[in-house]
C-alpha cells in the first residue's frame, strides 16, 4: 500500500460508523474533475474503511483518490483530518 | 426554510459570564461581529456527535457546548470586557459540500458594561 | 490562519451597473469560499458557496468565479436592494476565517 493510500485508510478508520455512513453518501455527490466516474452506490455503502480505501484507489489513483478523500472530509467539517490527510500524502 | 432561534439581547457585567443559545442541527457554528466589524469565526460543534473544533483566540474564553435532547447549541463566554460588546450569531453548514454557512440565526447582542 | 483580504473597502454606484468585489487567500483555498450578503441590523445571507454555486433563491445577477487565492463576486446589474456589506470566506481550513467586507453604498 502506497504513502497516500495508507493516510486515505488511516482518515477514514478515524471516522466514527455515523461518519463513514455521511461520508459515503457524500462521495456519491461530491463535484469530480471531468475524465473521473462515480463508484456505484449499491457497492459503496456495504464497504468497511479498507475496502473503501482499495475502492478510492482503484478508481481515482493515489493522488487525486487522497485529494477527493480530503475534499469530501472538508465537505463534512472535518478541515483538520482533510489537513493531516493532504500532509501526510505529500511528505 | 430553517429558522434558528437566537434570544435577542443580553447585558453583562466586565469579568461575568453569559450563556447563549441557540436551537439549531448539524455543524454550528459560533460568530463575532463588533459593531462596524467584519465576522470573526469563534468555534463550531456537530451537534450529533458533540464534535468541537474552537479559533485559538478564542479557545480560553469560549466552551461550546450541545444539549442533544432539546436540538441547543450552546457557546459560555467568560471574563467578558468591552471589547467582547459584539453581535453573537449561530449558524448551519446544511448545504452537501463546501461546508458554507448556510442558516444563521438573528445573533444576540450582548452589552459589557458596568 | 489563512487571511481573506478583500477589495474595495467600499463602492459607490449608481442602479444598473455592473460590479466586481475581489477577495484574496494567502493561500490556496481551492473553491472552498463563500460569499455573504449583510444588510444593517440584519444576519448575514449565504449568496455563494464552493466559489461558483449559487443558493438556493440568489438571482442570477450574483455570480461568483476564482479558485485556489483569487476569488470574485460580480453583481451584473446592481439593484437598490443589493446595498449592503459582502463578506467572503473560507471553510478549507480552521480557523473559518473572512474577509472585513466591502460596502456598496448609492453615489
Known amino acids: 500500500m502506497g504513502r497516500a493510500a495508507a493516510a486515505i485508510l488511516d482518515a477514514l478508520e478515524n471516522l466514527t460508523a455515523e461518519e463513514l455512513k455521511k461520508f459515503k453518501l457524500k462521495l456519491l455527490s461530491v463535484p469530480l474533475r471531468e475524465g473521473y466516474g462515480r463508484i456505484p452506490r449499491g457497492a459503496l455503502l456495504s464497504m468497511d474503511a479498507l475496502d473503501l480505501t482499495d475502492k478510492l484507489v482503484s478508481f481515482y489513483l493515489e493522488t487525486y483518490g487522497a485529494e477527493l478523500t480530503a475534499n469530501v472530509l472538508r465537505d463534512m467539517g472535518l478541515q483538520e483530518m482533510a489537513g493531516q490527510l493532504q500532509a501526510a500524502t505529500h511528505q | 426554510q430553517v429558522q434558528l432561534q437566537q434570544p435577542g439581547t443580553e447585558l453583562v457585567k466586565p469579568g461575568a459570564s453569559v450563556k447563549l443559545s441557540c436551537r439549531a442541527s448539524g455543524w454550528t457554528h459560533w460568530v463575532k461581529q463588533r459593531p462596524g466589524q467584519g465576522l470573526e469565526w469563534i468555534g463550531n460543534i456537530n451537534l450529533s456527535n458533540g464534535r468541537t473544533n474552537y479559533n485559538e483566540k478564542f479557545r480560553a474564553m469560549a466552551t461550546l457546548t450541545v444539549d442533544k435532547s432539546s436540538s441547543t447549541a450552546y457557546t459560555q463566554l467568560s471574563s467578558l470586557t468591552s471589547e467582547d460588546s459584539a453581535v453573537y450569531y449561530c449558524?448551519?453548514?446544511?448545504?452537501?459540500?463546501?461546508?458554507?454557512?448556510?442558516?444563521w440565526g438573528q445573533g444576540t447582542s450582548v452589552t459589557v458594561s458596568s | 490562519n489563512i487571511v481573506m483580504t478583500q477589495y474595495p473597502k467600499s463602492m459607490s454606484l449608481s442602479i444598473g451597473e455592473r460590479v466586481t468585489l475581489r477577495c484574496k487567500a494567502s493561500?490556496?483555498?481551492?473553491?472552498?469560499v463563500s460569499w455573504y450578503q449583510q444588510k444593517p441590523e440584519q444576519s448575514p445571507k449565504l449568496l455563494i458557496y464552493?466559489?461558483?454555486n449559487r443558493y438556493t433563491g440568489v438571482p442570477d445577477r450574483f455570480t461568483g468565479s476564482g479558485s485556489a487565492t483569487d476569488f470574485i463576486l460580480t453583481i451584473t446589474s446592481v439593484q437598490a436592494e443589493d446595498l449592503a456589506d459582502y463578506h467572503c470566506g473560507q471553510s478549507y481550513n480552521y480557523p473559518l476565517t473572512f474577509g472585513a467586507g466591502t460596502k456598496l453604498e448609492l453615489k
Open positions: 493561500e490556496n483555498v481551492g473553491s472552498y
Open positions: 449558524a448551519n453548514s446544511m448545504v452537501p459540500h463546501f461546508f458554507p454557512m448556510d442558516y
Open positions: 464552493g466559489a461558483s
